[in-house]
């Protein structure tokens, strides 16, 4: 039961995270005009990965797409790439994890297959989250660098008479959405990997073979099983399957701690 809960929760957390990564990637407010310690303007500028916008105090908003590919900064292209890779990996991870969910039965899919799929999706979520966090962090670093550069020459005077105010940009809402979403996807991926450990059989299951030694009735089970005497040392009720023995509540035997974010 704990494994199912961990897997389900991991899936939900990752789903929220990936939705957040998609939202952040599409958002226009990656960088917003810095209003602190600046003259109050009747125009507010903000920029995204795909277009830049201007909102006038009149309420009129105009957005312009970056219709060039080669003319864009390499860093912006890198951020775009990281976010898209994150989305693609996350989407594939979600698709894989749906089939891996223990609560969903697909034909006669074995637990080992589900475990492998859970691990695969978990790794995909981790990489997806890391891509998003990296993308957002690269953009944030770019902003910080530009911010201090524009602060250094905030006012470029023309003969000391006319001044040009340089627009400085600071962190936009999309950065925070991206960081949180990337973190959630990462946590979801870790939870999926933890759930995978619970789904995977810890031992190679063979048919039990009995060897009769003189004076003792000891059943030897190859493949890492502890040898157990036939007398009361294991009181758990067991169901014998073709592939070996497994306790009914073995599935629940892995304690898990969940971070609810």
């Amino acid at each position: 039961m704990a494994v199912t809960a961990c897997q389900g929760l991991g899936f939900v957390v990752s789903l929220i995270g990936i939705a957040g990564i998609i939202a952040a990637t599409c958002m226009d407010q990656w960088s917003t005009q810095d209003l602190y310690n600046n003259p109050v303007t009747a125009v507010f500028n903000y920029q995204g990965l795909w277009r830049s916008c201007v909102r006038e105090s009149s309420g009129f908003t105009e957005c312009r797409g970056y219709f060039t590919l080669l003319g864009l900064p390499a860093m912006l292209q890198a951020v775009r790439a990281l976010m898209i890779v994150g989305i693609v990996l996350g989407a594939i991870g979600l698709l894989v994890s749906i089939f891996a969910l223990k609560c969903i039965r697909i034909g006669s899919m074995e637990d080992s297959a589900k475990a492998n799929m859970t691990l695969t999706s978990g790794i995909m979520f981790i990489v997806s989250g890391l891509c998003a966090i990296a993308g957002v962090s690269v953009f944030a670093n770019m902003l910080v660098t530009n911010f201090w550069m524009s602060t250094a020459n905030m006012y470029t005077g023309m003969g000391g008479m006319v001044q040009t105010v340089q627009t400085r940009y600071t962190f936009g809402a999309a950065l925070f959405v991206g960081w949180v979403a990337g973190g959630l996807t990462l946590i979801g991926g870790v939870m999926m990997c933890i759930a995978c450990r619970g789904l995977a059989p810890e031992e190679t299951n063979y048919k039990a073979v009995s060897y009769h030694a003189s004076g003792h009735s000891v059943a030897y089970k190859p493949g890492g099983f502890k040898a157990s005497t036939g007398f009361g040392s294991n009181t758990k009720n067991k169901k014998i399957y073709d592939g070996g023995a497994r306790t009914e509540d073995e599935v629940q035997s892995y304690p898990s701690k969940h971070d609810y974010v």
Partner: antibody
Framework: QVQLQESGPGLVRPSQTLSLTCTAS????????MNWVRQPPGRGLEWVAF????????EYNPSVKGRFTILRDNSKNQLSLRLSSVTAADTAVYYC???????????WGQGSLVTVSS | DIQMTQSPSSLSASVGDRVTITCKSS????????????LTWYQQKPGKAPKLLIY???NLQTGVPSRFSGSGSGTDFTFTISSLQPEDIATYYC?????????FGQGTKVEIK
């Protein structure tokens, strides 16, 4: 068609408080930011105050800040300007104007003369 | 506050003449975000409310005759009436629409010779 109509008391004593009202018609009032601009007799135009379409954001000319208050009631299609502690320097024709694209004031009322005199 | 300096303060021209008014701002009115200049031109006839002619320094307001035009960028702007008509007798104002407080030029009074 777009119409803006200002109304006010006309004559007030120094240090008194008065209110100017601008009633809008012919457009969706709640979608537009609004302004008050004044013009002292025989002088140029002076921007007074701005209010966003929802009424949450306001800006004032430093010369009137703290004394004047701009308000709007979108349900009544009304813009108002409350003038307190008025002086002779506040004597002017007060115009309400609609804020549009380019932050330009595209429609103006006919103006309301406020005379501050004892 | 941003200072808007208009010149000349008044001018007299004949019907059909080309009239040019200049406006200089103490800070650039060019917004880097959309590369637009937030400068507006208004016409005010005696006893009337001002009328919007040009916004974004060069965009003609709907319904305004094409003889009116605006140009310039940053801090220096020009307003032109290509062929002065009798109905153009008015005072013309430029306005900074970029920085608060929004400020007007002192006005240019146009008269007919």
């Amino acid at each position: 068609q777009v119409q803006l109509q200002e109304s006010g008391p006309g004559l007030v004593r120094p240090s008194q408080t008065l209110s100017l009202t601008c009633t809008a018609s012919g457009f969706t009032f709640s979608k537009y930011a609004m302004n008050w601009v004044r013009q002292p007799p025989g002088r140029g135009l002076e921007w007074v105050a701005f209010i966003s379409n929802g009424g949450s954001y306001t800006e004032y000319n430093p010369s009137v800040k703290g004394r004047f208050t701009i308000l709007r009631d979108n349900s009544k299609n009304q813009l108002s300007l409350r003038l307190s502690s008025v002086t002779a320097a506040d004597t002017a024709v007060y115009y309400c104007a609609r804020h549009d694209k380019g932050n330009a004031l595209d429609y103006w009322g006919q103006g309301s003369l406020v005379t501050v005199s004892s | 506050d941003i200072q808007m300096t208009q010149s000349p303060s008044s001018l007299s021209a004949s019907v059909g003449d080309r009239v040019t008014i200049t406006c200089k701002s103490s800070q650039s009115l060019l917004n880097s975000g959309n590369q637009k200049n937030y400068l507006t031109w208004y016409q005010q006839k005696p006893g009337k409310a001002p009328k919007l002619l040009i916004y974004w320094a060069s965009n003609l307001q709907t319904g305004v005759p094409s003889r009116f035009s605006g140009s310039g960028s940053g801090t220096d702007f020009t307003f032109t009436i290509s062929s002065l008509q009798p109905e153009d007798i008015a005072t013309y104002y430029c306005q900074n629409d970029y920085f608060y407080p929004l400020t007007f030029g002192q006005g240019t009074k146009v008269e007919i010779k």
